[in-house]
Interface confidence: medium
């Protein structure tokens, strides 16, 4: 039996969000079963459907309504003919959308004007994605490649960060970390420090 | 003419064994998946199962999975439901339907009693 | 398992829009279908694949999905579209399908 994914290049990259059918011709065979398979494990989909283009010659059709990140991998179709177990050529699915965020900023408890990092990290496809910091309602850096780590220098009260993550299909806004104030007991080395600190919030640096 | 030409109403005792069968006509059996589906008096539908085209592989509503076993016979065009223990809840009206997702062909039904 | 959720009732004057819904967490990654059955008869398949009307059907029914909702719209519901009305999907996996609970479609 000849088997081929039709309709598809080689790789076939789609929307998050959009419909995708990935179609299986299958010649030579009178009754074939076919069967898709992503990433080596069988799809176990009912949606799909056949079509007899003639007696010997069918195509069958797997159709994804709504494509999401999960959906992308490798895909093919296979049947059973006479006890061996034919499969066509795979088609790589390339699922495109807004940045996915791998590393979100952490809430974190902090001397006043003590430094401290946060971590932001998202993915594609599509790449390139670029960080972009906020404190609070502020851009305070980039846009800058991700992953991106932001030094602070210090606060002197509870303060909010998050980060935006922005690539050609868009941008995804981060969780949104609390930094909140150590309480330092009175007396502390770290007490009398903050007195030989200036109070005002400091620019942070912004680096890879 | 596409038909599906079910067997006949059933009384059955529970814990008794039956089988009910759909035989199709007018379209090539091995080109359509056929699913089975449950309706009890005065309630709605219910997907049972179905059985592929070639009859190699069958899929199961979790409710009914181990409770039947929907079988075909290609060579007389003849699609099964088969019980190995009836119980007093499975007396319902049984419906084969020629496809999975496109139910486009329905059968008469076969009406299932199961009393003692 | 699986479930999808139908309202029981929905009751129209003739000539009015009636709208069916249809509750299901796998409805943004699967289609949803709809079938009608008239009192004593088998069920017919009136929209598939969301929003295709199946053949034979009359241009008054329309479907429609948006995230996890899908909706059969009547628009100018006729006495003869007195019946129950099921939506028909499949599981997140896909691995096995599922009616709704029926909708009852009076049109007073």
């Known amino acids: 039996a000849g088997l081929k994914l039709m309709g598809a290049p080689v790789k076939l990259t789609v929307s998050q969000g959009q419909p995708v059918k990935l179609n299986c011709s299958v010649e030579g065979m009178e009754e074939p079963d076919i069967q898709w398979v992503k990433d080596g494990a069988v799809v176990q989909n009912l949606d799909q459907l056949y079509i007899p283009v003639s007696e010997q010659h069918w195509i069958g059709f797997l159709s994804l309504k709504s494509v999401e990140r999960s959906d992308a991998g490798r895909y093919w179709c296979q049947v059973e003919d006479g006890g061996e177990t034919e499969i066509s050529q795979p088609v790589w699915l390339t699922v495109e959308g807004v940045p996915f965020f791998t590393v979100e900023p952490k809430d974190l408890a902090v001397p006043p004007n003590a430094p401290f990092q946060l971590s932001c990290e998202a993915v594609g496809p599509p790449e390139p994605v670029t960080i972009v910091w906020w404190r609070g309602t502020t851009k305070i850096g980039g846009p800058a490649p991700s992953p991106s780590v932001l030094n602070v220098t210090g606060v002197t009260q509870s303060t909010m960060f998050s980060c935006e993550a922005h690539n050609l299909k868009g941008l995804a806004s981060s969780r949104t970390a609390t930094v909140h104030l150590q309480l330092v007991p009175r007396g502390s080395s770290a007490h009398h420090h903050h007195h030989h600190h200036h109070s005002a919030w400091s620019h942070p640096q912004f680096e890879k | 003419e596409v038909q599906l030409v079910q067997s006949g109403a059933d009384v059955k005792k529970p814990g008794a064994s039956l089988t009910i069968s759909c035989q199709a006509s007018g379209y090539t059996f091995t080109d359509y998946w056929i699913s089975w589906v449950r309706q009890k008096p005065g309630k709605g539908l219910e997907w049972m199962g179905s059985?592929?085209?070639?009859?190699?592989?069958?899929h199961y509503g979790p409710s009914f999975q181990g409770h039947v076993t929907i079988s075909a016979d290609r060579s007389t065009a003849t699609a099964y439901l088969q019980w190995r223990s009836l119980e007093a809840s499975d007396t319902a009206m049984y419906y084969c339907?020629?496809?999975?997702?496109?139910?486009?062909?329905w059968g008469p039904g076969t009406l299932v009693t199961v009393s003692s | 398992s699986y479930e999808l959720t139908q309202p029981p009732s929905v009751s129209v004057s003739p000539g009015q829009t009636a709208r069916i819904t249809c509750s299901g967490d796998?409805?943004?990654?699967?289609?949803a279908y709809w079938y009608q059955q008239k009192s004593g008869q088998a069920p017919v398949l009136v929209i598939y694949e969301d929003s295709k009307r199946s053949s034979g059907i009359p241009e008054r029914f329309s479907g429609s999905s948006s995230g996890t909702m899908a909706t059969l719209t009547i628009s100018g519901a006729q006495v003869e579209d007195e019946a129950d009305y099921y939506c028909y999907s499949a599981n997140q996996r896909g691995n096995y399908m599922v009616f709704g609970g029926g909708t009852k479609l009076t049109v007073l």
């Open positions: 796998a409805l943004p990654k699967k289609y």
């Open positions: 339907v020629r496809g999975y997702t496109h139910l486009r062909t």
């Open positions: 059985i592929t085209r070639s009859s190699s592989r069958t």
